[in-house]
């Protein structure tokens, strides 16, 4: 996989008025890396590994960049004409990548109320607009504003591309990202399924990098794909990943099954625990009312395009 740096910024308007704050997250190699702390008005590393990337250097440069980008995005939102009453969001995602062959890619994407309406390849400066009439209108709005804005000249896009790559290379130079390996914690649980059956779930958490093999074996042989359910490999918010695999087995046959895990050249096998059946339940909280800008920002988070 290529090394990547991804900026994710969101600004909001309420009843046509652009709000003063902004949301910003930066992902390095797919991991939450930086976040803009609205209370302290500073870029903050996400976890110890992110702090290790810069070592004893300050995060002033990152704070300055994110603040500038947030300001630009607020101005862009202010120029979107069709803002009706209520809550609206403008999100910008900028990504740059360095591939194994040293080739690079950079792109920028704009979303309004969670819907993509404008993309740009920052190397070729080619713009792409989805077919929908709403997207076409929004794109025209934003492109006109960007053209008017003297800052958004041809050289500006080259600079955006170059700056992103420069930052990515700077982070990679620390070596922390390249050499980091965090082995997974593996946990096997069982839960009641139907009469005579139990569901066994194998969870791997807190691992890095994201590539992992997690599979159920019966008598040492991997079960076929269609008898297993896999969860996505997802960031867990600590600079590491998590995933799971589950299968249904006959009660009394637990001894035949093991969860096999392989990660970064290491492997392990994990038996099904015997004894009491644990019933696992998920509790989801639903928020219907939001009060104040902070709540709006928090609510907005779940709308993000990851």
């Amino acid at each position: 996989e290529p090394h990547s740096l991804r900026y994710n910024l969101t600004v909001l308007s309420w009843d046509g008025s652009v709000q003063s704050g902004f949301l910003a997250e930066v992902h390095l190699d797919g991991q939450p890396f930086l976040r803009y702390d609205r209370q302290k008005c500073r870029a903050k590393p996400q976890g110890q590994w992110a702090e290790d990337v810069l070592g004893n250097k300050t995060w002033d440069r990152e704070t300055r960049d994110l603040t500038g980008n947030g300001k630009d995005l607020r101005m862009t939102l202010a120029h979107i004409k069709d803002q009706k009453e209520g809550l609206h969001s403008l999100q910008e995602i900028r990504v740059c990548e360095i591939h194994e062959d040293n080739s690079t890619r950079s792109s920028q994407h704009f979303y309004y109320d969670g819907e993509l309406f404008l993309s740009q390849n920052l190397e070729t400066e080619e713009w792409t607009v989805p077919q929908s009439s709403r997207a076409q209108t929004l794109a025209m709005n934003v492109r006109n504003f960007l053209k008017e804005d003297a800052m958004k000249t041809k050289t500006h896009y080259h600079a955006m591309h170059a700056d992103c790559l420069q930052e990515l290379r700077r982070y990679l130079e620390s070596g922390v990202v390249l050499r980091r390996t965090v082995p997974p914690m593996v946990n096997v649980t069982r839960s009641e399924a139907s009469e005579g059956n139990i569901t066994v779930t194998c969870r791997a958490s807190s691992f890095y990098p994201r590539n992992i093999i997690l599979t159920w074996r019966q008598d040492g042989v991997s079960l076929s794909h269609d008898t297993q359910q896999w969860g996505d490999v997802l960031p867990d918010g600590n600079g590491t990943y998590q995933t799971w695999v589950a299968t249904r087995i006959c009660r009394g046959e637990e001894q035949r099954f093991t969860c096999y895990m392989e990660h970064s050249g290491n492997h392990s096998t994990h038996p099904v625990p015997s004894g009491k059946v644990l019933v696992l339940q998920s509790h989801w909280q639903h928020h219907h009312h939001h009060h104040g800008l902070n709540d709006i920002f928090e609510a907005q988070k779940i709308e993000w395009h990851e």
Epitope: R217, D219, G220, V221, S222, Q255, R256, T258, Y260, H267, S268, T269, H270, P271
Partner: antibody
């Protein structure tokens, strides 16, 4: 290339015990189970049990519980089967086998002949 | 325990022949059926797993088929090196059990 090298033939007295070894090479030993199979003279094959070299967990054929004990030494990538209280019924060729994770008994050792005789 | 029956204990065929060896399980084994070849020197090799999947390195003249309780191994073009005893084995239910073997000889 996956190889399972078994220990040489054994001639033992009734009532004694014997330890058959199976040294694995050509793959990561703790990745795959080791299975043990018995073949009495001129007869079919019987599955004895298997061991997971990673954690030492075993699953055995009820018929061989109390007769066979399966162990591993991870440091030397060697699996062992200890047979106790031997009788003439235990005279047989004993095979170890391993898997590639997709099929049972994928690779076999050359077999160890155990002869129980006074 | 599941009984695996190979009714033909020995079989004579000529080189180039198509040979089929049968195996029956005492109950449905859901295609968890493997075939092994044991040479006269005692060497054992996996040929076919999960009824019809050819193990890597095994010549394509070997094939397997079947379902439920009835399974078979076919050698499409018998060669001298195929002289051996063939065992079926079920992997569906513990304990794993083997057929009694079919010894293949040249006419």
């Amino acid at each position: 290339e996956v190889q399972l090298q078994q220990s040489g033939p054994e001639l033992v007295k009734p009532g004694a015990s014997v330890k058959v070894s199976c040294k694995a090479s050509g793959y990561a030993f703790t990745k795959y189970n080791i299975y043990w199979v018995k073949q009495s003279h001129g007869k079919s094959l019987e599955w004895i049990g298997y061991i997971d070299p990673y954690n030492g967990g075993t699953v055995q054929n009820q018929k061989f519980k109390g007769k066979a004990t399966l162990t591993v030494d991870k440091s030397s990538s060697t699996a062992y089967m200890h047979l106790n209280s031997l009788t003439s019924e235990d005279s047989a060729v004993y095979y170890c086998a391993t898997t590639d994770g997709y099929s049972l008994f994928t690779y076999w050792g050359q077999g160890t002949l155990v002869t129980v005789s006074s | 325990d599941i009984q695996m029956t190979q009714t033909t204990s020995s079989l004579s065929a000529s080189l180039g022949d198509r040979v089929t060896i049968s195996c029956r399980a005492s109950q449905d084994i859901g295609n968890y059926l493997n075939w092994y070849q044991q040479k006269p020197d005692g060497t054992v090799k996996l040929l076919i797993y999960y009824t019809s999947r050819l193990h890597s390195g095994v010549p394509s003249r070997f094939s397997g088929s079947g379902s439920g309780t009835d399974y078979s191994l076919t050698i499409s073009n018998l060669e001298q090196e195929d002289i051996a005893t063939y065992f079926c084995q079920q992997g569906n239910t513990l304990p794993f059990t083997f057929g009694s073997g079919t010894k293949l000889e040249i006419k």
